[in-house]
């Protein structure tokens, strides 16, 4: 039975040209995390594999940085980066857990950031 839950940064906003950290955390399970995939709508952004480390999709290499931890840092944000992001945790033996983050990139310099999520 899958007992785990994913906590995420939830709905967040950031300024155009700035950067943001997307972070998820899997809790309440002893399952081993074998891989985390990060997706933006229907695009694979990056993968963090327990054995192979990080792979950043070539088309995002200039603007996506791995980490911190299993999270993902998006840089040089544009309004087109607004949308849904998913962290997909592949675990053994539980299976797959998915978390959702909604990012809004604002033109204004008064973007309100959601509470900064930190992994203890």
């Amino acid at each position: 039975m899958m007992t785990g839950t994913i906590e995420t940064t939830g709905n967040i906003s950031a300024e155009k040209g700035g950067s943001i950290i997307l972070q998820c955390h899997l809790s309440s399970t002893t399952a081993q995390v074998t891989q985390v995939n990060w997706e933006q709508q229907d695009q694979l952004l990056a993968i963090c594999n327990a054995d192979l480390g990080w792979h950043i999709s070539p088309s995002f290499k200039d603007r996506v940085a791995p980490g911190p931890g299993l999270g993902l840092t998006l840089q040089s944000l544009t309004v087109n980066d607004t949308g849904e992001y998913f962290c997909i945790y592949h675990t053994y033996p539980d299976g797959t857990y998915t978390g959702r983050i909604f990012l809004e990139v604002l033109e204004s310099s008064v973007a309100e950031h959601g509470a900064r999520f930190q992994i203890p």
């Epitope: 074998t34 229907d42 695009q43 694979l44 993968i47 594999n49 054995d51 792979h55 053994y92």
Partner: antibody, heavy 118, light 107 residues
Framework: EVQLLESGGGLVQPGGSLRLSCAAS????????MHWVRQAPGKGLEWVAS????????SYADSVKGRFTISRDNSKNTLYLQMNSLRAEDTAVYYC???????????WGQGTLVTVSS | DIQMTQSPSSLSASVGDRVTITCRAS??????LNWYQQKPGKAPKLLIY???SLQSGVPSRFSGSGSGTDFTLTISSLQPEDFATYYC?????????FGGGTKVEIK
């Protein structure tokens, strides 16, 4: 240089068994998921089975479930496919292949031919 | 299981032609779509992974696009060594499934 070398193919009667091996070199075998993919003569590609890096998680095509078993020995850098209760429709070239990140298959062996016939 | 439908099943083209092969999934597979090239008697070769990423060492005349259910492999200027069979493959979920293949022949 990544190399995958299959062996163990041959002619076997229906109902018989074969064990295919794939010797891997040129990369850290224990870090990669591995696959078996087959191709019947003149036909397309069909995924058969896969196994995660640690060997803990395995998955199979419905057509071989209960008859084929995928396994690996990371200390020997070798992938195996134990094939039991073979049928004529299992006749194919069997390829061993490497699957980084479980998203794509980047290297394939040269294949070994399995012929099931009486 | 996710069905992958490739079209056309075969095509005739000349050196220098622009060639487009399409692949449709029976359900959304995000960008978990790969393209392979296979020549007679040889193992398949990875061309494009994750829908649009060019595998190292593959010529830039090959490109991939699409997401969700509809995907395209484009060869911008067909070369003599490109005459082969091309397969799409989804890795969104097991069982992994391949398209039926597209044979690119010399006109």
């Amino acid at each position: 240089e990544v190399q995958l070398l299959e062996s163990g193919g041959g002619l076997v009667q229906p109902g018989g068994s074969l064990r295919l091996s794939c010797a891997a070199s040129g990369f850290t075998f224990s870090s990669y998921s591995m696959h078996w993919v087959r191709q019947a003569p003149g036909k397309g590609l069909e995924w058969v089975a896969s196994i995660k890096s640690s060997g803990g998680y395995k998955s199979y095509a419905d057509s071989v479930k209960g008859r084929f078993t995928i396994s690996r020995d990371n200390s020997k850098n070798t992938l195996y496919l134990q094939m039991n209760s073979l049928r004529a429709e299992d006749t194919a070239v069997y390829y061993c292949a490497r699957g980084p990140y479980d998203v794509w298959i980047d290297y394939w062996g040269q294949g070994t031919l399995v012929t099931v016939s009486s | 299981d996710i069905q992958m439908t490739q079209s056309p099943s075969s095509l005739s083209a000349s050196v220098g032609d622009r060639v487009t092969i399409t692949c449709r999934a029976s359900q959304s597979i995000s960008s978990y779509l790969n393209w392979y090239q296979q020549k007679p008697g040889k193992a398949p070769k990875l061309l494009i992974y994750a829908a649009s990423s060019l595998q190292s060492g593959v010529p830039s005349r090959f490109s991939g696009s699409g997401s969700g259910t509809d995907f395209t492999l484009t060869i911008s200027s067909l070369q003599p060594e490109d005459f082969a069979t091309y397969y799409c493959q989804q890795s969104y979920s097991t069982p992994l499934t391949f398209g039926g293949g597209t044979k690119v022949e010399i006109k």
